[in-house]
């Protein structure tokens, strides 16, 4: 079954290469187990950047190799992606799955365009 997912249209990463955004889903029921996946759509590719499963009220547990961290509050997930560089600029899509209890619901956001600007190197001081 389909579910609405909202996320910001644009986010600018910090000078330290960190981008944060909220992914909010309209839960049709009382889900106890939720899976959140961040997809990057760019360069003619789709990449699962990170994924986490969590029980409502608990911390997000991300899969290995994750460059993401996050917290949940109700039907909102606060996602942070770290270590970004200019070449990582792209459309980052939030995918939410309500895993348990049945029925299964799937929602995919329209994506957040994350812009990353590499910092200028500090000039040498005399």
């Amino acid at each position: 079954k389909a579910m609405h997912v909202a996320q910001p249209a644009v986010v600018l990463a910090s000078s330290r290469g960190i981008a944060s955004f909220v992914c909010e889903y309209a839960s049709p029921g009382k889900a106890t187990e939720v899976r959140v996946t961040v997809l990057r759509q760019a360069d003619s590719q789709v990449t699962e950047v990170c994924a986490a499963t969590y029980m409502m009220g608990n911390e997000l547990t991300f899969l290995d190799d994750s460059i993401c961290t996050g917290t949940s509050s109700g039907n909102q997930v606060n996602l942070t992606i770290q270590g970004l560089r200019a070449m990582d600029t792209g459309l980052y899509i939030c995918k939410v799955e309500l895993m348990y209890p049945p029925p299964y619901y799937l929602g995919i956001g329209n994506g957040t365009q994350i812009y990353v600007i590499d910092p200028e190197p500090c000039p040498d001081s005399d």
Epitope: R40, Q45, T47, G83
Partner: nanobody, 125 residues
Framework: EVQLVESGGGVVQTGGSLRLSCAAS????????MGWFRRAPGKDREFVAA????????AYADSVLGRFTISRDNANEMAYLQMNSLNPEDTAVYYC??????????????????WGQGTQVTVSS
């Protein structure tokens, strides 16, 4: 480096399926991000798919999304590429590759330092 040997290529009709295998040896397989690439005649090497060290995260080229599935079996040191709904544009030599790096946003650009010899896939119309 890890040694890689591909198998499973062949000739198939349009709409058919093939499953490519990549056998690894020499190093701890689970420490490597695995990728599949292909080179069609007269074209540059092209990224096809990649999978994280645990197998939990994947990436696909738009051209194969929904048709190809990458997977891995760390216990048996194997990587796989299931290819369905093949068409003549998929004709190429397919290479398995290993990158000793963690996952990120652009696995197609990882430094893959180990490559197999390739296996030919021909899709006839």
């Amino acid at each position: 480096e890890v040694q890689l040997v591909e198998s499973g290529g062949g000739v198939v009709q349009t709409g058919g399926s093939l499953r490519l295998s990549c056998a690894a040896s020499g190093r701890t397989f689970s420490m490597y991000t695995m990728g599949w690439f292909r080179r069609a005649p007269g074209k540059d090497r092209e990224f096809v798919a990649a999978i994280s060290r645990s197998g939990g995260l994947k990436a696909y080229a738009d051209s194969v999304l929904g048709r190809f599935t990458i997977s891995r079996d760390n216990a048996n040191e194997m990587a796989y590429l299931q290819m369905n709904s093949l068409n003549p544009e998929d004709t190429a030599v397919y290479y398995c590759a290993a990158a000793p790096v963690p996952w990120g946003t652009r696995p197609s650009h990882f430094t893959y330092d180990s490559w197999g010899q390739g296996t030919q896939v021909t899709v006839s119309s």
